[in-house]
């Protein structure tokens, strides 16, 4: 489900429960995808040790996932509401090519993959709607991405094993990154 | 066995500069949150700061601009600046196993003390 | 700020018993509460996170609840090694705040 239980409208308008903000609609939809990609990690885990690995021994990779810096106005130093949403969507548009990969790269979890696939672009549509400045917001070109895709799919076994535990572990990493800003929101 | 250990801790008069370290044994920091926590002499636990990546940190209102978090892969320094005798506390590093979205403590440091007095 | 308000600062109670401590946040947390377990001269041990998870070898007899803005720990079937101060931490934004954790309830067991 690209949405937590009891996040659709059906839930939302129940009487018994109050519908929930924009802040906490964003808010517990990334902690369903952390959820999500926790257990992914879970599996990839399971089958190599990469996740044992230091952050400085798989430093050296040619992938160009998002990351959040001090520019992007996201750290409690510097804190930016407007620049650090831009970057937040950003990111996340910008993830969407590597989430296509991730789908599959899993065997017992092929849903849980979907899962995490479907709820980052309702997130994203979630964080549009927050957003004053979308003209900011520059969008992924679709055949850089395709390329992209396609020489990520041609990599050695090891490697793509490699690309999927950096994807899953940077991509942890954006989202809690995101999420402790957007509480400061 | 996973543990951290800080050091550094001192007498040191009013107004000097110290830096504390805590060291990782069993596992690497770079995996890892790392949070500083204090404890003044018969007080309860005051938290200071954090440090979640390389760069990205976050400190409680008190210590803004006095206290400062870096990590490398094997330590994580706390420098601070202007002591007072109301710094006069011992010094606990912890680790957050940085898997979930809360903060949440699970590995001590056993402590060091730092004594601000003239 | 998320301020944690812990009640009460001291309690007492007999080998075998039982007793409450309360914590209290400024705003909603949801289910981001840990609890702490301190004894003298020692390092603060993690026992329960996410309200009422138990960390990893705590007894069962330690039992966390709540969630938004009240939790809730209980000790059970108390014993001679229980006597520690307590603390509660709020994990849900180590932004803007003075303090993360509680003031801390001793507790004494006669």
């Known amino acids: 489900a690209p949405v937590p239980p009891g996040e659709d409208s059906k839930d939302v308008a129940a009487p018994h429960r109050q519908p929930l903000t924009s802040s906490e609609r964003i808010d517990k939809q990334i902690r369903y995808i952390l959820d999500g990609i926790s257990a992914l990690r879970k599996e990839t885990c399971n089958k190599s040790n990469m996740c044992e690995s230091s952050k400085e021994a798989l430093a050296e990779n040619n992938l160009n996932l998002p990351k959040m810096a001090e520019k992007d106005g996201c750290f409690q130093s510097g804190f930016n509401e407007e620049t650090c949403l831009v970057k937040i969507i950003t990111g996340l548009l910008e993830f969407e090519v590597y989430l296509e990969y991730l789908q599959n790269r899993f065997e017992s979890s092929e849903e849980q993959a979907r899962a995490v696939q479907m709820s980052t672009k309702v997130l994203i549509q979630f964080l549009q709607k927050k957003a004053k400045n979308l003209d900011a917001i520059t969008t992924p070109d679709p055949t850089t991405n395709a390329s992209l895709l396609t020489k990520l799919q041609a990599q050695n076994q090891w490697l793509q094993d490699m690309t999927t535990h950096l994807i899953l572990r940077s991509f942890k990493e954006f989202l809690q990154s995101s999420l402790r800003a957007l509480r400061q929101m | 066995c996973q543990s951290l250990e800080e050091s550094g801790g001192r007498l040191v008069t009013p107004g000097t500069p110290l830096t504390l370290t805590c060291t990782a044994s069993?596992?690497?920091?770079?995996?890892?949150?790392v949070t500083w926590v204090r404890q003044a002499p018969g007080k309860g636990l005051e938290w200071i700061g954090i440090?979640?990546?390389?760069?990205e940190t976050a400190y409680a209102t008190w210590a803004i601009g006095r206290f400062t978090i870096s990590k490398t892969s094997t330590t994580v320094d706390l420098k601070m600046t202007s002591l007072t005798a109301a710094d006069t506390a011992t010094y606990f590093c912890?680790?957050?196993?940085?898997?979930?979205?809360?903060?949440?403590?699970?590995?001590w440091g056993q402590g060091t003390l730092v004594t601000v007095s003239s | 700020a998320y301020d944690m308000t812990q009640t009460p600062a001291s309690v007492s109670a007999a080998v075998g018993g039982t007793v409450t401590i309360k914590c209290q946040a400024s705003?909603?947390?949801?289910?981001?509460l840990s609890w702490y377990q301190q004894k003298p001269g020692q390092r603060p041990k993690l026992l329960i996170y996410?309200?009422?998870t138990l960390a990893s070898g705590v007894s069962s007899r330690f039992k966390g609840s709540g969630s938004g803005t009240e939790f809730t720990l209980t000790i059970s079937d108390l014993e001679c090694a229980d006597a520690a101060t307590y603390y509660c931490?709020?994990?849900?934004?180590?932004?803007?705040?003075?303090?993360?954790f509680g003031g801390g309830t001793e507790v004494v067991v006669k």
């Open positions: 705003q909603s947390i949801n289910n981001e």
């Open positions: 996410r309200a009422s």
């Open positions: 069993g596992f690497s920091l770079s995996n890892y949150y």
């Open positions: 912890a680790r957050d196993d940085s898997s979930d979205w809360d903060a949440k403590f699970n590995l």
């Open positions: 440090i979640y990546g390389s760069d």
């Open positions: 931490q709020q994990g849900y934004s180590l932004r803007n705040i003075d303090n993360a």
